[in-house]
């Protein structure tokens, strides 16, 4: 009469889901403190940097309490998708003198691509409405020199390493409430 | 490079007030919530506020809510701690600190506040 | 009387591996992140763990951090003179809606 019904799918415990969530980001939170002072090393920053194209930050001591799971991971995975195009474009343009982060640059990338991936089955698993697929972005226009490309990678690298501390705090508060 | 700077710090009978600053370089200053902590002399840590990068939430510890006031000035890049109704026991070298998420990353060197008659 | 429970001191010789504990409740570390700071003698507090067990840039590996359950402990291998200092870990305490640190160790390298 054929196979035998297989075992029956056991429904994955959120809170083991949300566990390897932060275990990833916590581990793309090293990879980038290590890239962001390797960069310090080479090319000392002179000062705050920022990008306008980058994402504002979303979270504060202040935010903590209201946070709820959908929210946070739509909002996580926007910006880290703007992070990741963000440092698509530092790896194409940011000039010669970033090829020196390379293979460490290249690595952050699929770490974070990987990391996206999770967030994604993440709020799949967990029944939470999938975000509309993200409008075209506008091209992220060369550096004008080459100084401008790195002072693009300590406001990138900076901006991650922030967005990516908040996370695995908001993360692991929100792991308490579930 | 990070620099913290504090200053305001001083001699204050109980009952008075002080307004202490703290001036940051070196980063996006407004990227990131802020700190008060404090250490008694020959005591331990204790954290005393924070405030939320863009000023809108401020939580305090127990021992200072309704005295002690957490502000800041993002054009300025200062952090400020107003203190009234001061005590001997509010007697300690206070630091600003930065907050990326859970921790404070780096401090200041700290300014000693003495409440004595 | 401080909210986490640290031994006041703690000694060891050069080159030897020293284990710092810390103890908490489920209010604290047992749903937060564990930090730990250094504090050399006469300066202001620095940076040494956080989320349980990463590295800020510039501290040496010999500093590792770890956690289990309301427990955090701060290990320091290859000891060195420089490493006497006061150490302090940290944790946001849901209950209380702020930061509460142990009462710090004294490390004393004999």
């Known amino acids: 009469p054929g196979p035998p019904p297989g075992p029956p799918r056991v429904s994955p415990d959120p809170r083991a889901e949300l566990d390897s969530t932060v275990l990833l980001t916590r581990s793309l939170l090293a990879d980038t403190r290590q890239l962001a002072a390797q960069l310090r090393d080479k090319f000392p920053a002179d000062g705050d940097h920022n990008l306008d194209s980058l994402p504002t930050l979303a979270m504060s001591a202040g935010a903590l309490g209201a946070l709820q799971l959908p929210g946070v991971l739509t909002r996580l995975r926007a910006d880290l998708l703007s992070y990741l195009r963000h440092v698509q474009w530092l790896r194409r343009a940011g000039g010669s003198s970033l090829k020196t982060l390379e293979p460490e640059l290249g690595t952050l990338q699929a770490r974070l691509d990987r990391l996206l991936r999770r967030l994604q089955l993440l709020m799949s698993r967990l029944a939470l409405p999938q975000p509309p697929p993200d409008p075209p972005a506008p091209p992220l226009a060369p550096p004008s020199s080459a100084w401008g490309g790195i002072r693009a990678a300590h406001a990138i690298l900076g901006g991650l390493h922030l967005t990516l501390d908040w996370a695995v705090r908001g993360l692991l508060l929100l792991k308490t409430r579930l | 490079e990070v620099q913290l700077l504090e200053s305001g710090g001083g001699l204050v009978q109980p009952g008075g007030s002080l307004r202490l600053s703290c001036a940051a370089s070196g980063f996006t200053f407004s990227h990131y919530d802020m700190n008060w902590l404090r250490q008694a002399p020959g005591k331990g840590l204790e954290w005393v506020a924070v405030?939320?990068?863009?000023?809108?939430?401020?939580f305090y510890a127990d021992f200072v809510k309704g005295r002690f006031t957490i502000s800041r000035d993002n054009s300025k890049n200062t952090l400020y701690l107003q203190m009234n109704s001061l005590r001997a026991e509010d007697t300690a070298v206070y630091y600003c600190?930065?907050?990326?998420?859970?921790?404070?990353?780096?401090w200041g060197q700290g300014t000693l506040v003495t409440v004595s008659s | 009387q401080s909210v986490l429970t640290q031994p006041p001191s703690a000694s060891g010789t050069p080159g030897q591996r020293v284990t710092i504990s810390c103890s908490g409740s489920?209010?604290?570390?047992?749903?937060?992140?564990v930090n730990w700071y250094q504090q050399l003698p006469g300066t202001a507090p620095k940076l040494l763990i956080y989320?349980?067990?990463l590295l800020p840039s510039g501290v040496p590996d010999r500093f590792s951090g770890s956690k289990s359950g309301t427990s955090a402990s701060l290990a320091i291998s290859g000891l060195r003179s420089e490493d006497e200092a006061d150490y302090y870990c940290?944790?946001?305490?849901?209950?209380?809606?702020?930061?509460?640190f142990g009462g710090g160790t004294k490390l004393t390298v004999l």
């Open positions: 405030i939320s990068y863009d000023g809108s939430n401020k």
């Open positions: 600190a930065r907050t990326p998420g859970s921790h404070f990353d780096y």
């Open positions: 940290s944790a946001w305490d849901d209950s209380l809606n702020g930061v509460v």
């Open positions: 989320y349980d067990d």
């Open positions: 489920s209010s604290n570390i047992g749903n937060n992140a």
